[in-house]
């Protein structure tokens, strides 16, 4: 606890002090006082540098004195033999004695008192910037007129902060301008304009005189402009050293004028005004700006329109133009939007065709569709080449955006039929010789595939089973082979309206209009073993002449078996209808005269016993196309016959082409259109 005064006595005083003693006293007086320590008695063993016994006076880290020996007062009116004056409020006194004393020494008596110090004069560093006032136990600072004392209670400054300028034009100067500005001051001025305007500061060189920089180039007094995260300055010296026109790109500007204690000059004066915030004329590729101007400022609106083949993509929506506004921050709205090349996207796939993965799907890119040759060809022309158009669609010169359509190639077997191995009445065949051949397993019969969705057969094949199971692509009709081939599922059976339905079909003698169509649920995939046969044309070129050769195929009765396991085929000539009439019916169910022969029937066979038979019904009588020798068309369908191994009757398909086309068109799916 600090005290104002006190007494310090050596151990046993006034008796002799003991040997080997070390004792210390910590003196503390109140804050704001110094200490006056004085000795009235001193009798300590003398030694060089007081090395044996001593009394030591320490102030902080400084030794103020070290005493030994005997002292007496020089002044008869004063008992003081030694004294110390320190301007601090703390002091330490340490007494030490060694192990022996040659004489009897009585030690010391000392007193301390708190004394006033003059902070204004006693220290090297002046505590006040302007006026210092001492009082007992302390001091206070004071300021000249128009100055005020800062919160540190030591420094004086002028009250030059807090001004906010909001007008679009104005003038600001340093305090007292053009008289010298106050020292030791920090003046802050704020310019706050409405958003969208930037503060532009203008100065004249002669309106600026601020204490120059030191030898290191640091401004002692300085003027600084701060606009957001941008700073202009610090500036100092005689004549303004910065740009005379400062565009801050901000609507808010802070002006900071900092002065030190020395070297006052006349200061500075500036003008400011608010400019609408400019937005840069940006280079946006592949677009045009409307209106076109040399300079765009706050609130200007432009329409940016993409050139043909370019679009602006925002989210999933593509547009050809957008609006952009010059914003208050000097940036354009929608600046992220760009005119990019139109992307036509991954081209749509097509059934039975393909399109190579394009290197690019952007405007101007070219893709090519191809059909799965040789089983499909491009029906609707156009060559299959599409380019990415400006509207974002893949476009063909002929078809426009319509996709190409790959349709099956008809009438072209992968392997031509050759009568290699002679079998009575026919040859072994491979399904690749007759890829249009369809197998019906109940009743055991045949049919001809004419496109992806339709099978042509004889009416008598399907009249008793309107949901026939059919197979394509297999030479053998063993269950094991059919299990691995393609089964066709019917959607609907269309029997020719001219076919007479009977109560007892076994007794039929009239096979006129023996033709039917089966619409399939799913399209058939074409390939080497499955491919349609063509239909006859309607021109006279497709009128058959006697002797014209045709191919028949099927799994019907042979000389060896009631049902063939592997496909059989034969080449037969067309014969006059009378040849069929002349053959005696093998197992007649009625009079020979009851059997009907019409122009809708073709008679063929009679050569080397080659003929169709039970189980071949519905299969095609395939004739070479007169206009394209590489193709076969279905001239007839196996219908009936008087006797196997003689002549057979075939439905004349040419007479039914209109009915076939009409039926298919009326019962097509959108997928086919």
């Amino acid at each position: 606890e600090p005290t104002m005064y006190g007494e310090i006595l050596s151990p046993n005083y006034p008796q002799a002090y003991p040997s080997e003693v070390e004792k210390s006293w910590d003196i503390e007086v109140p804050e704001g006082y110094g200490i006056h320590l004085y000795f009235t008695h001193l009798d300590i063993e003398l030694s060089e540098n007081c090395a044996y016994d001593s009394v030591q006076i320490i102030s902080g880290d400084t030794e103020e004195g070290r005493l030994c020996g005997q002292r007496s007062s020089n002044n008869p009116h004063s008992p003081i033999v030694e004294e110390f004056q320190v301007p601090y409020n703390k002091l330490q006194v340490i007494f030490k004695s060694d192990f022996s004393n040659e004489e009897r020494f009585t030690g010391f008596a000392a007193y301390y008192v708190a004394t006033d110090i003059n902070e204004c004069t006693d220290f090297v560093d002046v505590p006040c910037s302007h006026f210092c006032n001492n009082f007992i136990g302390g001091y206070f600072c004071s300021c000249p007129p128009e100055y005020f004392l800062h919160d540190d209670m030591k420094n004086c400054g002028v009250n030059c902060s807090g001004d906010v300028f909001t007008a679009l034009i104005g003038e600001i100067a340093s305090p007292n301008y053009p008289k010298p500005y106050p020292e030791n001051s920090r003046c802050e001025y704020q310019i706050r304009l409405e958003k969208g305007f930037q503060v532009v500061v203008t100065l004249r060189r002669e309106d600026f005189d601020v204490e120059a920089a030191d030898s290191a180039g640091n401004c002692l007094d300085s003027l600084v402009f701060v606009a957001g995260d941008r700073q202009f300055g610090p500036y100092c010296g005689h004549g303004f050293p910065g740009p005379l026109n400062i565009e801050t790109k901000s609507n808010a500007l802070d002006i900071i004028f900092q002065t030190d204690l020395t070297g006052q000059k006349k200061g500075w004066k500036l003008r400011y005004h608010g400019d609408p915030m400019p937005c840069p004329k940006e280079d946006t590729p592949n677009s045009v700006w409307e209106p076109a101007k040399a300079k765009y400022v706050f609130r200007d609106v432009v329409q940016i329109t993409c050139l043909d083949g370019f679009e602006v993509v925002e989210g999933r929506v593509g547009a050809t133009s957008f609006y952009s506004t010059c914003q208050s921050n000097g940036k354009w709205s929608n600046s992220k939007l760009k005119c990019q090349p139109v992307d036509c996207g991954i081209p749509e796939s097509i059934e039975n065709g393909k399109v190579e993965d394009p290197e690019s799907t952007l405007f101007g890119s070219v893709i090519r569709y191809t059909c799965e040759e040789p089983y499909y060809y491009m029906e609707n022309g156009g060559g299959g080449e599409y380019h990415c158009a400006g509207n974002g669609s893949w476009v063909n010169e002929v078809l426009g955006p319509e996709l190409p359509k790959c349709v099956p190639v008809c009438g072209v077997p992968r392997e031509p039929f050759e009568e290699k191995q002679r079998i009575i009445g026919g040859s072994d065949a491979d399904i690749k010789n007759f890829p249009w051949q369809v197998f019906f397993d109940n009743p055991w019969a045949g049919g001809a595939l004419i496109n992806e969705y339709w099978v042509l057969t004889a009416a008598h094949v399907v009249e008793g089973n309107r949901e026939p199971t059919m197979y394509v692509g297999s030479t053998s009709v063993q269950t094991s082979r059919l299990a691995k081939s393609k089964m066709l599922t019917p959607e609907h059976v269309f029997i020719h309206p001219g076919w007479k339905l009977l109560e007892v079909p076994e007794g039929r003698t009239n096979f006129d209009n023996d033709i039917a169509l089966v619409r399939l649920k799913d399209p058939v995939k074409m390939g080497p073993t499955v491919s349609p046969i063509c239909l006859p044309g309607t021109s006279s070129d497709y009128n058959l002449m006697d002797g014209d050769l045709g191919l028949i195929s099927g799994w019907g009765r042979t000389e060896k078996r009631d049902r063939a396991v592997r496909l059989k085929a034969a080449r037969l000539p067309v014969a006059p209808l009378r040849k069929c009439k002349e053959v005696k019916v093998e197992k007649p169910t009625a009079d020979a005269e009851a059997y009907v022969f019409t122009p809708n029937m073709i008679c063929a066979g009679g050569e080397k016993g080659m003929d169709s038979c039970k189980g071949d019904s519905g299969g095609a009588f395939a004739v070479q196309d007169p206009n394209d020798k590489t193709k076969f068309y279905a001239a007839g369908l196996v219908s009936w016959g008087p006797q196997c191994g003689t002549y057979g009757l075939y439905t004349r398909v040419k007479n039914y082409v209109d009915w076939i086309m009409k039926t298919m068109q009326e019962n097509s799916t959108p997928r086919e259109d």
Epitope: D441, N442, V477, S480, R481, A483, V565
Partner: antibody, heavy 125, light 107 residues
Framework: EVQLVESGGGVVRPGGSLRLSCAAS????????MSWVRQAPGKGLEWVSG????????GYADSVKGRFTISRDNAKNSLYLQMNSLRAEDTALYYC??????????????????WGKGTTVTVSS | DIQMTQSPSSLSASVGDRVTITCRAS??????LGWYQQKPGKAPKRLIY???NLQSGVPSRFSGSGSGTEFTLTISSLQPEDFATYYC?????????FGGGTKVEIK
């Protein structure tokens, strides 16, 4: 040349087991169904069991049901008959025969067009 | 199970004779019937399938007929090599069943 060769016959005690094999050659084995037929000494023919081309469908005579199992390994062109709980009345000459099955949903069967020479099974204590 | 009754169980005939063997099914079997010939110590051999179809390689003197429940095997002119036992087989439903056999002997 189409050929079927049976093996695995022999003498076995009642209650015992035997496995007959039939090796096929000269035709595409996995296109055909197969049957086992037996003939007791001095008696007529009795169909024992049959299996379709891929082994998914089997049939048995009532006299062997639950005791005999027919199977095939198409990779090895082989037919098998596993005979368990054998009885004296199972003593016979066992033939394997080839069956043809045509059609996809409606089946047309042509049974036993080719036969093997047979293998003898004797069940005796 | 379908029972197949074959008759006669045996017959004696001379070379050149016309021989007829009958098979009766206990229920209708359409035409799902085959005829087999077996000679002593040999495996059976198929003659006729689907009631009336002659197996490839079989002489044309053999013929089959019938449908439903009544079936016939006819040998139009018996030859020395035709002396054997003949069996019918129904395959209309599982279990397949053979007739009891007809033994054709030399008179």
């Amino acid at each position: 040349e189409v050929q079927l060769v049976e093996s695995g016959g022999g003498v076995v005690r009642p209650g015992g087991s035997l496995r007959l094999s039939c090796a096929a050659s000269g035709f595409t084995f996995d296109d055909y169904g197969m049957s086992w037929v037996r003939q007791a000494p001095g008696k007529g023919l009795e169909w024992v069991s049959g299996i379709n081309w891929e082994g998914g469908s089997t049939g048995y005579a009532d006299s062997v049901k639950g005791r005999f199992t027919i199977s095939r390994d198409n990779a090895k062109n082989s037919l098998y008959l596993q005979m368990n709980s054998l009885r004296a009345e199972d003593t016979a000459l066992y033939y394997c025969a080839r069956d043809e099955q045509l059609g996809g949903q409606t089946y047309y069967y042509y049974y036993m067009d080719v036969w093997g020479k047979g293998t003898t099974v004797t069940v005796s204590s | 199970d379908i029972q197949m009754t074959q008759s006669p169980s045996s017959l004696s005939a001379s070379v050149g004779d016309r021989v007829t063997i009958t098979c009766r099914a206990s229920q209708g079997i359409r035409n799902d019937l085959g005829w087999y010939q077996q000679k002593p110590g040999k495996a059976p051999k198929r003659l006729i399938y689907t009631a009336s179809n002659l197996q490839s390689g079989v002489p044309s003197r053999f013929s089959g007929s019938g449908s439903g429940t009544e079936f016939t095997l006819t040998i139009s002119s018996l030859q020395p090599e035709d002396f054997a036992t003949y069996y019918c087989l129904q395959y209309n439903q599982v279990p397949l069943t053979f007739g009891g056999g007809t033994k054709v002997e030399i008179k």
